[in-house]
């Protein structure tokens, strides 16, 4: 496959594995209320995320509300949200550093410096991977020792929620793209040949007579 | 099982200080605040402060000059002390646990009832 | 500070009645209340929060409304276990603020 291909695909796979971990950063369903306890008067769900929780009631109605206070916060719950928006202002970053070292702009005089800046734009998607996937695990590690742990009462056991899956697959894409773009990068180094294949030559320059090549005219 | 169980003298003399433990079982202080109110007949139920679980601090303005509220993770203990206490002081003082990112009192202790008297 | 005000100190009821318990802050809370219940001799325990949030465990007889400055805790039909004081407090900034208490007595 051709180094811009490679660019494509993996530029694609960031920016699709962007807008994941932006919805999942956003989505109040990082923990979900276990139901384990049948006895529970009036079963209602509970969802937790990084900005809001929400409560579904047994009738279906749902109110949801941002937190009162980032100091109400846990103190994961307040470094998730630091990672989470660091790695998406980071793919922000990554995504202008992607495009000036891609070979179908011209931000960068094509050559060794741009598909330098091609390769950090990969390694950014990588790193921004890297970095949505700390609070990803941490939270789900918490999430899980609590709902094993004999301590916690049943009423405070969560589940897993759908945003930690969402999350989970946007670095996974995040890091393949990145993975691509730094592929991509390589060969376009290694492999001149493999390169983007528009190639442009310049106009034909007239003789030094003046005259042009007679099979321009008709 | 959630619980905040309170320790402290029941009578304090005039001027003095009062300090309250509250040690709390089945979650962990790394995870929720703790807030501090108190009830007389008086005044009924005064928000005094909450010590939140990353470890700052806020207060009712109208006691922050004698009021200091710290905690001890590794033993699940919030410590509350007010300083110059008076008559008007008389009350139960409770902790609570703050619902999770909200200003919230969810479960309160079994109370400490002081009395300000020499 | 926010003031909430609690304009019935007592409210006589039998059991099988609804009751509403009513509850005004002096400026709008954008539905940042909570209700709670004490009984004699007992802590305060929380029944809803967010104005209309149940909280875990409390029967569907508590229903909670309003918005702006006015709130209403609502008991759809009173049980002889129901009858205690019942305190509003607003969320919406510190300090947190309480009422003054409604004391739910039979009639």
């Known amino acids: 496959m051709g180094s811009a291909a490679l660019e494509i695909l993996g530029l694609v796979l960031c920016l699709v594995g962007w807008g994941g971990l932006i919805l999942a950063c956003g989505l109040p369903m990082w923990q979900v209320t276990a139901f384990l306890d049948h006895n529970i008067v009036t079963a209602q769900t509970t969802w937790k995320g990084l900005w809001m929780s929400c409560v579904v009631q047994s009738t279906g109605h749902m109110q949801c509300k941002v937190y009162d206070s980032v100091l109400a916060l846990s103190t994961e719950v307040q470094a998730a949200r630091a990672l989470t928006v660091g790695a998406v202002l980071l793919a922000f970053v990554a995504l202008f550093v992607t495009l000036a070292g891609a070979q179908c702009t011209t931000c960068v005089a094509p050559g060794p410096a741009k598909a330098r800046v091609a390769l950090t734009g990969g390694v950014l998607y990588l790193l921004c991977g890297l970095l949505a996937l700390v609070p990803l695990c941490w939270f789900a590690n918490i999430v899980v020792r609590e709902f094993y742990d004999p301590s916690v009462p049943v009423s405070q056991k969560y589940e897993l929620g759908a945003a930690l899956y969402i999350g989970w697959a946007a670095t996974a894409l995040l890091m393949v793209g990145g993975g691509l773009l730094c592929c991509g990068a390589w060969v376009c180094t290694s492999r001149p040949d493999l390169s983007f294949p528009v190639k442009y030559s310049a106009p034909r320059r007239p003789t030094a007579t003046g005259d042009y090549d007679k099979k321009n005219y008709v | 099982q959630v619980q905040l169980k309170q320790s402290g003298p029941g009578l304090v003399q005039p001027s003095q200080s009062l300090s309250i433990t509250c040690t709390v079982s089945?979650?962990?202080?790394?995870?929720?605040?703790v807030h501090w109110v108190r009830q007389s007949p008086g005044k009924g139920l005064e928000w005094l402060g909450v010590?939140?679980?990353?470890?700052?601090?806020d207060y009712n303005g109208a006691f922050k000059s004698r009021l200091s509220i710290s905690k001890d993770n590794s033993k699940s203990q919030v410590f509350f002390k007010m300083n110059s206490l008076q008559a008007d002081d008389t009350a139960i003082y409770y902790c609570?646990?703050?619902?999770?990112?909200?200003?919230?009192?969810?479960?309160w202790g079994t109370g400490t009832s002081v009395t300000v008297s020499s | 500070d926010i003031v909430m005000t609690q304009s019935h100190k007592f409210m006589s009821t039998s059991v099988g009645d609804r009751v509403s318990i009513t509850c005004k802050a002096s400026?709008?809370?954008?539905?940042?209340v909570a209700w709670y219940q004490q009984k004699p001799g007992q802590s305060p325990t929380l029944l809803i929060y967010?104005?209309?949030t149940r909280h875990t465990g409390v029967p569907d007889r508590f229903t909670g409304s309003g918005s702006g400055t006015d709130y209403t805790l609502t008991i759809s039909s009173v049980q002889a276990e129901d009858l205690a004081l019942y305190y509003c407090?607003?969320?919406?900034?510190?300090?947190?603020?309480f009422g003054a208490g409604t004391k739910l007595e039979l009639r």
């Open positions: 400026q709008d809370v954008s539905t940042n």
């Open positions: 967010w104005a209309s």
């Open positions: 010590k939140w679980s990353g470890g700052s601090t």
């Open positions: 407090q607003q969320h919406y900034s510190t300090p947190l603020t």
């Open positions: 089945g979650f962990s202080l790394i995870r929720y605040g």
């Open positions: 609570a646990r703050g619902l999770d990112g909200y200003y919230v009192p969810d479960v």
